[in-house]
């Protein structure tokens, strides 16, 4: 099994009320095959944002075209941001398995969201 | 209903080439990856090609590469298979095939038979 | 290369199970595609290891390990005689790849 590291490069990304924010996320290699799929928070509450292979997230677009083969790049976009979407987000590798099972996760990336400029 | 309706197969001699076309209905098109796959008489399926959802990244089996362009047309919902210097070896049920996330297949068409002959 | 049996006979109602090796387990994912009768469409019964498509009946089931994928067909029925393909996808080639196929006849 290779060794892979999920990188999410931005500790922290505001944005203002409304507006989209881009969470950044890559992989550094595609083995072994499983899923990305993104949460909010940690531990068995956490909220999941994103998956890549299931589920309706029509707020949630892969930045990068995920139907390429060679594609490492696991970056979302959500859109019309409130605040209630505050809160740090993990991009999370999946080995693929009955279930999948959790390999790595990000650091995080702590998203804060500033009042709509008037 | 997912529908996949290959066309443009026929008798062609050696060395001729040809066009195959791939029309897509029940889904967004532009969505998923698509593959072309074919069945030579009395054989299995063999892998061709395939072609990401937006049509950026290409991928072929080695025996094809050179001769078969895999393309695709989003605003018309089809996919195609430029096909050249064509050989006995290539008489086959053509098949489009429709990707998962993962880029097995779901969903296939009927298929159109080529028949390179002198 | 995917390896699978030529052919496999079993009783209506009997199990029979179908393996499929020679993918990598960390990078390969595999499906299960049928075909009842050379040159028609096949049909997808199993992606993804073990993924059934919600219009292919409960008695169909799939599950990977190690180096092999097997589909079950728990209380087989005389329509699924049929060829049974076994499709691989290498996360590590961007290649897809298929087994020579399995006869399966229901006696």
């Known amino acids: 099994e290779e060794e892979l590291q999920v990188i999410q490069p931005e500790k922290s990304v505001s944005v203002a009320a409304g507006e989209s924010a881009t969470l950044n996320c890559t992989a550094t290699s595609l083995i072994p095959v499983g899923p990305i799929q993104w949460f909010r928070g940690v531990g068995p509450g956490r909220e999941l944002i994103y998956h890549q292979k299931e589920g309706h997230f029509p707020r949630v677009t892969p930045v990068s075209d995920p139907t390429k083969r060679n594609n490492m790049d696991f970056s979302i976009r959500i859109s019309n941001i409130t605040p209630a979407d505050a809160g740090t987000y993990y991009c999370v590798k999946f080995r693929k398995g009955s279930p999948d099972v959790e390999l790595k996760s990000g650091a995080g990336t702590e998203l804060s969201v500033r009042a709509k400029p008037s | 209903d997912v529908q996949l309706v290959e066309s443009g197969g026929g008798v062609v001699r050696p060395g001729e080439s040809l066009r195959l076309s791939c029309a897509a209905s029940?889904?967004?098109?532009?969505?998923?990856?698509m593959s072309w796959v074919r069945q030579a008489p009395g054989k299995g399926l063999e892998w061709l090609a395939g072609?990401?959802?937006?049509?950026?990244?290409?991928y072929y089996i080695d025996s094809v590469k050179g001769r078969f362009t895999i393309s695709r047309d989003n605003p018309k919902n089809s996919l195609y298979l430029q096909m050249s210097s064509l050989t006995a070896e290539d008489t086959a049920v053509y098949y489009c095939?429709?990707?998962?996330?993962?880029?097995?297949?779901?969903?296939w068409g009927l298929g159109t038979l080529v028949t390179v002959s002198s | 290369a995917l390896t699978q049996p030529a052919s496999v006979s079993a009783n209506p109602g009997e199990t029979v199970k179908i393996t499929c090796s020679g993918g990598?387990?960390?990078?390969?994912?595999y499906a299960w595609y049928q075909q009842k009768s050379p040159g028609s469409a096949p049909v997808t019964v199993i992606?993804?290891?073990?993924k059934r498509p919600s219009d292919i009946p409960s008695r169909f089931s799939g599950s990977a390990s190690g180096s092999a994928a097997t589909l079950i067909i728990t209380g087989v029925r005389v329509e699924d005689e049929a060829v049974y393909y076994c499709?691989?996808?290498?996360?590590?080639?961007?290649?897809?790849?298929f087994g020579a196929g399995t006869t399966l006849t229901v006696l």
């Open positions: 095939a429709r990707e998962t996330w993962n880029h097995l297949f779901d969903y």
């Open positions: 029940g889904f967004t098109f532009s969505s998923y990856a």
């Open positions: 072609i990401s959802a937006g049509g950026s990244d290409t």
């Open positions: 990598d387990y960390y990078s390969t994912y």
């Open positions: 992606h993804s290891d073990d």
């Open positions: 499709g691989g996808y290498d996360g590590r080639t961007y290649i897809n790849t």
